[in-house]
């Protein structure tokens, strides 16, 4: 099954793909496409390299690494929910049935909602403690403005403190939400 990678709406997504050139600069054609790897090439090609250079790309898709050293990892800029799905990295290695084909699943999550700035001071003043979360790397860590992130183990305590309080009403009125997971 496909390896899964995650990013949030508005962020850049990173899909890793590597090979080792037989010699420095001795490159092989690589394609990236949306959809699982088919028999020929890639489906719905978004980027392609040849033995010398990137010879085709579409907006928002680029190679951030040094592809001349075999780092053909794909960066997708400013992702939206529509970018979710399977991506194919195909490395067309010389020889009989030698192609390396990787299907990578990209999951895009909605961006966390930031409360209105006018209410931010109230919230941080009421809860000055430092709360942190750990995600699966930079793409998973998102801070709500200058607000502290909320550890999942502290959700129930925080909910109890908010219940029936004026702050809860203020927070609701401002349209802010707390997303879990």
């Amino acid at each position: 099954s496909e390896v899964e990678y995650r990013a949030e709406v508005g962020q850049n997504a990173y899909l890793p793909c590597f090979y080792t050139p037989a010699a420095p600069g001795n490159l092989v054609p690589v394609c990236w496409g949306k959809g699982a790897c088919p028999v020929f090439e890639c489906g719905n090609v978004v980027l392609r390299t040849d033995e010398r250079d990137v010879n085709y790309w579409t907006s928002r898709y680029w190679l951030n690494g040094d592809f001349r050293k075999g780092d053909v990892s794909l960066t997708i800029e400013n992702v939206t929910l529509a970018d979710s799905g399977i991506y194919c990295c195909r490395i067309q290695i010389p020889g009989i049935m030698n192609d390396e084909k990787f299907n990578l699943k990209l999951v895009i999550k909605p961006a966390k909602v930031t409360p209105a700035p006018t209410r931010q001071r109230d919230f941080t003043a009421a809860f000055p403690r430092m709360l942190t979360t750990r995600g699966h790397g930079p793409a998973e860590t998102q801070t709500l403005g200058s607000l502290p992130d909320i550890n999942l183990t502290q959700i129930s305590t925080l909910a109890n403190e908010l219940r029936d309080s004026r702050l809860a009403n203020d927070l609701r009125d401002s349209g802010a939400t707390i997303r879990i997971g």
């Epitope: 054609p29 699982a36 088919p38 028999v39 090439e41 392609r48 085709y56 010389p94 192609d99």
Partner: antibody, heavy 120, light 107 residues
Amino acid sequence: QVQLQESGPGLVKPSQTLSLTCTVSGGSISSGGYYWSWIRQHPGKGLEWIGYIYYSGSIYYNPSLKSRVTISVDTSKNQFYLKLSSVTAADTAVYYCASLMVWGVMGDYWGQGTLVTVSS
Amino acid sequence: EIVLTQSPATLSLSPGERATLSCRASQSVSSYLAWYQQKPGQAPRLLIYDASNRATGIPARFSGSGSGTDFTLTISSLEPEDFAVYYCQQRSDWPPTFGQGTKVEIK
């Protein structure tokens, strides 16, 4: 406009090797995006993909024929080749060379086909 | 290998009529399905690729639809030159395989 032309003997004896040449004109065999392929069609029947070679040197063979088939290329002559060893009557077919263009709007180019009969 | 089953085996229609051809795959081929047309004594010609995209130079009366395992080729109004054998072909999994063909003949 890419054009392809098959050539080779129309009659091969059982247990021998079938050898065909495809000559490409109107395009370079070393260009990216073209999958240079061999496909065959048994008399009155459906189509069977034998294999392809890509300009990178990537080669794929149909598993049902893999132990007997070789596809190669000579870029200086702009030709690619099919060899099928240990043939039997079941290999009697029209053999097509074809090119599938997969960059941009997909298109294909085929030779007119050559009938190869395996018989003693 | 993926088996493609086409139906009907033969379709008898008159010029100007609509033709609907079906292709079913033994497992999902996503949208990686093509349709070819073959006339007697000629090589096949690619009509549709990736289920619904017309190949270069193919008239608009040819259209394809479907995904996964069930696909349809529609010829909206048959022209005399459309009477031929039609094959579906998958490129999802190696080796690429073809259906057994549907013959569209003049009624």
